[in-house]
Structure formats: C-alpha cells, structure tokens
C-alpha cells in the first residue's frame, strides 16, 4: 500500500477554493481514504472519509473528487479562511 501527496506547499487567498491531490496504490478490494488536518500542536483533526465504493464525499466546506480507476482522491476546501493554514494528510485504510 502506498500514498503520495506531490504538492509540498500551496498558497491561496481567502474565500477561494483549493484542491489538494492524493494518489494511492492498494491491493485491497474495499478500502477507505481519510483526510486529516495537522494543527501546529501536531494534533491530527479528521476532516472527511471517502469509501472505495461510495459516491464523492462532501462535508461542509470539504469535498472529495474520487477517481477509483486513476487511484486519485483529491480534497477541495472551499471558502478558505485564515485558520485553514495547516498541513493536510491523506491516509489509506481498510
């Protein structure tokens, strides 16, 4: 299993939307991809979950564009605000 986030850093103005890309490799038949936000304190905050057999997930300002064939799961954060400045991680799990 492998997860790759190619964007090391992204800068966007407030109010706009940003898309964070994540590519993965897995041999699992059924799985979940999770997106987390890491605070400066290193605390990890769960944002959204995408199931491998589910439609694109959406939760408030967070939405996922899931392309199973391409093994891509992009997170879009809409209406950016200052407190969205953080590190974002995607993770793969069964």
């Amino acid at each position: 299993q492998k997860v790759t986030q190619a964007q090391s850093s992204v800068s966007m103005p407030v109010r706009k939307a940003v898309t964070l890309n994540c590519l993965y490799e897995t041999s699992w038949w059924s799985y979940y991809i999770f997106w987390y936000k890491q605070l400066p304190s290193k605390e990890m905050i769960f944002l959204i979950r995408q199931g491998s057999d589910e439609q694109n997930a959406k939760s408030g300002r967070y939405s996922v564009n899931f392309k199973k064939a391409a093994k891509s799961v992009a997170l879009t954060i809409s209406a950016l605000q200052l407190e969205d400045s953080a590190k974002y991680f995607c993770a793969l799990g069964e």
Partner: antibody
C-alpha cells in the same frame, strides 16, 4: 426554506449607533461566508463587509473601516453589524447575503432601512 | 480597487428582443464575475456566477460569457418579467465591487 431576515434598522442621528441583525435559516449557517451589502436610495449596490464561516477572517470597505464591526454567532445562526459614528452617507437599505462556494451572493435578505438624519 | 464599468447604463427594449449588457473591469478577474437582477423594492437575485454558470432556477434565456476583463450578460428573448436593473459584481479580490447597474426598460 433557505432564508435571511434582517432587523434593527431605523432612524438615527449623525454620530449615533445602530446594531443590525440577520437571522439565517434553512441551511448550515456555519459553513458560509456572510456579507453586508448596502444600497443608498436610488443608487447602486455597495459591499460593506464580510466575515468567514468561523469568524476568523474579516474585511471591510474603506468607507466603513473603523466605524462598523461585523460579527456572527454560529450557535444562533445570526450575523450582526455594529454601526458607530453614523453619517448621512450611511443612509441605505442594508442587506445580508450568503456567499456560495463559488464566491457569488446566492441568498439575500429583504433588507433593512437605515436612515441617518438630524 | 477593481473598477467595474457597466454599459449601457440604461436600455429600452421590447418583449422578444435579444439584449446584451457588458461589464468591463480595470484588472483581470479570471472568471470571478457574477450577474444579478434587481426589481424595485426587492433584494437582488443571483442570475449568473463564475462568469457563465447559470444559477439554479434561473431561466435558460439568461447567459453569461467572457473572462479576464470583458464580460457580457445576454437575454436571448426578453420576457415582461425581465424588465429590471442588472448589476455585475467581481468576487476576485477585496473590496468586492459592483458595476453601476443597467436599467432595462420597456420600449
């Protein structure tokens, strides 16, 4: 039904203060940027201020900076505009509006009239 | 600040006419341009967002086009309920600004 309802307008003397409120219903208020936009009698639209969904990001038009304060209470689904040191040129209908995720004002209230006159 | 120049400021037309309103901006907006309709005594109503996307519930006779600094709102066949004032608005940067409006009147 998605709705915004302003209140708090009225007649005030120059130099006076007024607090406008906007009650939101029918949507998850805490997910959206909100703005105040005003329209002087017979004139066009002028954006006044916006506040981010959590309240962490705020901007004002130069014409009201230092005099007006925008705030929100997500627990009460309410948006506010505290207006101090009011001037005659602040006379207008004040609208609250929701900004959608593509940066357009998709929901507007009916407006509340503020008249500044001695 | 981004200046918004709307033209014409007023326009007389007849039911069934095709009408075009233009909005020119002082700097490039990409596609961060919205159009609103306002009737007397009423709040504005969103018609077009992101330059060319039709807001849900808005009749398909309304369309928007353009990018950068030049944008247009077109009404393909005017209906009686379309006589109103139309505003463009940039959402690219603060302060958010509106055009001066175009008043569409019955000829």
């Amino acid at each position: 039904e998605v709705q915004l309802l302003e209140s708090g307008g009225g007649l005030v003397k120059p130099g006076g203060s007024l607090r406008l409120s906007c009650a939101a219903s029918g949507f998850t208020f805490s997910d959206y940027y909100m703005s105040w936009i005003r329209q002087a009698p017979g004139k066009g639209l002028e954006w006044v201020s916006y506040i981010s969904s959590s309240g962490s990001t705020i901007y004002y038009a130069d014409s009201v900076k230092g005099r007006f304060t925008i705030s929100r209470d997500n627990a009460k689904n309410s948006l506010y505009l505290q207006m101090n040191s009011l001037r005659a040129e602040d006379t207008a209908v004040y609208y609250c509006a929701r900004e959608n995720y593509l940066n357009a004002f998709d929901i507007w209230g009916r407006g509340t009239l503020v008249t500044v006159s001695s | 600040d981004i200046q918004m120049t709307q033209s014409p400021s007023s326009l007389s037309a007849s039911v069934g006419d095709r009408v075009t309103i233009t909005c020119r901006t002082s700097q490039s907006l990409s596609n961060y341009l919205n159009w609103y309709q306002q009737k007397p005594g009423k709040a504005p109503k969103l018609l077009i967002y992101a330059a060319s996307s039709l807001q849900s519930g808005v009749p398909s006779r309304f369309s928007g086009s353009g990018s950068g600094t030049d944008f247009t709102l077109t009404i393909s066949s005017l209906q009686p309920e379309d006589f109103a004032t139309y505003y463009c608005q940039q959402s690219y940067s603060t302060p958010l600004t509106f055009g001066g409006g175009t008043k569409l009147e019955i000829k």
